[in-house]
């Protein structure tokens, strides 16, 4: 699997997920979200060469296309295959308030 | 919707449904297909903008961060969303058998 | 330059609902909360809730909980602000406006307003 | 909730006089939870001073405002024509946000 646990010990150049580090402050503009500061959201890239972790049939014909026409711009693409939640915390007013924000994290890639 | 409706009748840069048509034996070196000779297959490409028809809240964030952080490499990829199946005919011996291949035909497209 | 730009004026049944927008522009606008302020004909301020969009956290007053919905729409940067079971008294003014940045915090820049009537 | 409560309701002064408006909180606001607003007849309310004491971008320096806990003032040190308005003390330290009933400004 494209997952954290092979992308993060390999220097993988096919599709894969990178870590991302987000300051939510400095690189989101929320002032709102009080704990964590940041998170790692990750995120998918590289390329998706013929039957790499192919999500649909029509991901691997694409994929299997490509390789036959080596000169089309149709290829699959590497995205988010696993997401993860992240629990915030935040502050109504002087009230703290905890919420779990869905989807927030990656954690594996695919090609689609 | 990023769709087939839409895309074929704009000129659109970002991210949007492409036309592709694939001959089974020429594209794709299928011998075995015998009807139909091809099919308009259909690709995602084009850039994903910040609230391009984002797929989740961390393809939402990560255009955000895109946005805000213009030298990053990070941004979503503009994949298929919805796809339908393709009724083909193919041969067993001298046995026609008609077979429905899920996920064939990409409708609509997304930034992941 | 920050807009906010809401909906026009609205005359509804009591019992019924309206549902008010407010498009932003010029700034980011899933880095701000969106608040919604109500103001029935010469008197005062009254706030309604919040709204955090990407995320779509809405924070209610109580007098409100129930009745009211706060959503983004953050691919068209449009916020809503839906009140249903419409009473004579709900005739207000309704303003959003763009906080600071927190839940709860001053108002840097307001729309200019829908006025919504609510009689019989 | 947190009441708000503004004095006076009403002020009638002579222009380049000083305005001073106050504003009592029902329980303690910390210091910096208060925001205040002037509102023109048919206009939507505008910031003038948020964290009790911050002047907004763009507000003129004749406007400011003090005070933290339960008691807090707003001041323009010498009015002017364009000052004609009511104006509105808001706190933000606990939900609901609550208003003051306002001040109406007024030139002599």
């Known amino acids: 699997a494209l997952d954290t646990n092979y992308c993060f010990r390999n220097l993988e150049e096919n599709c894969c997920v990178r870590p991302l580090y987000i300051d939510f402050r400095q690189d989101l503009g929320w002032k709102w979200v009080h704990e964590p500061k940041g998170y790692y959201a990750n995120f998918c890239s590289g390329p998706c060469p013929y039957l790499r972790s192919a999500d649909t049939t029509h991901s691997t014909v694409l994929g299997l296309y490509n390789t036959l026409n080596p000169e089309a711009s149709a290829s699959p693409c590497c995205v988010p295959q696993d997401l993860e939640p992240l629990t915030i915390l935040y502050y109504v007013g002087r009230t703290p308030k905890v919420e779990q924000l869905s989807n927030m994290v990656v954690k594996s890639c695919k090609c689609s | 919707a990023l769709d087939t409706n839409y895309c074929f009748r704009n000129l659109e840069e970002n991210c949007c449904v492409r036309p592709l048509y694939i001959d089974f034996r020429q594209d794709l070196g299928w011998k075995w297909v015998h009807e139909p000779k091809g099919y308009y297959a259909n690709f995602c490409s084009g850039p994903c903008p910040y609230l391009r028809s984002a797929d989740t809240t961390h393809s939402t964030v990560l255009g955000l961060y895109n946005t805000l952080n213009p030298e990053a490499s990070a941004s979503p990829c503009c994949v298929p969303q919805d796809l339908e199946p393709l009724t083909i005919l193919y041969y067993v011996g001298r046995t026609p058998k008609v077979e429905q291949l899920s996920n064939m035909v990409v409708k609509s497209c997304k930034c992941s | 330059q920050v807009q906010l730009v809401q909906s026009g004026a609205e005359v509804k049944k009591p019992g019924s609902s309206v549902k008010v927008s407010c498009k932003a522009s010029g700034y980011t606008f899933s880095s701000n909360v969106i608040s919604w302020v109500r103001q029935a004909p010469g008197k005062g301020l009254q706030w309604v809730g919040g709204?955090?969009?990407?995320?779509?956290?809405?924070n209610y007053a109580q007098r409100f909980k129930g009745r009211v919905t706060l959503t983004a729409d953050t691919s068209t940067n449009t916020v809503y602000m839906e009140l249903s079971n419409l009473r004579t008294e709900d005739t207000a003014v309704y303003y959003c406006?763009?906080?600071?940045?927190?839940?709860?915090?001053?108002?840097?820049?307001w729309g200019q307003g829908t006025l919504v009537t609510v009689s019989s | 909730e947190i009441v708000m409560t503004q004095s006076p309701a009403s002020l009638s002064l002579s222009q380049e006089e000083k305005v001073t408006i106050t504003c009592r909180a029902s329980q303690s606001l910390g210091s910096s939870y208060l925001a205040w607003y002037q509102q023109k007849p048919g206009q939507a309310p505008k910031l003038l001073i948020y964290g009790a004491s911050s002047r907004a971008p763009g507000v003129p320096s004749r406007f400011s405002g003090s005070g933290s806990g339960t008691d807090f003032s707003f001041t323009i040190s010498s009015l002017e024509p364009e000052d004609v308005a009511v104006y509105y003390c808001?706190?933000?330290?606990?939900?609901?946000?609550?208003f003051g009933q306002g001040t109406k400004l007024e030139i002599k």
């Open positions: 808001q706190q933000y330290a606990d939900s609901p946000i609550t």
């Open positions: 406006a763009r906080t600071l940045g927190l839940v709860l915090d001053a108002m840097d820049y």
């Open positions: 709204v955090i969009p990407i995320v779509d956290i809405a």
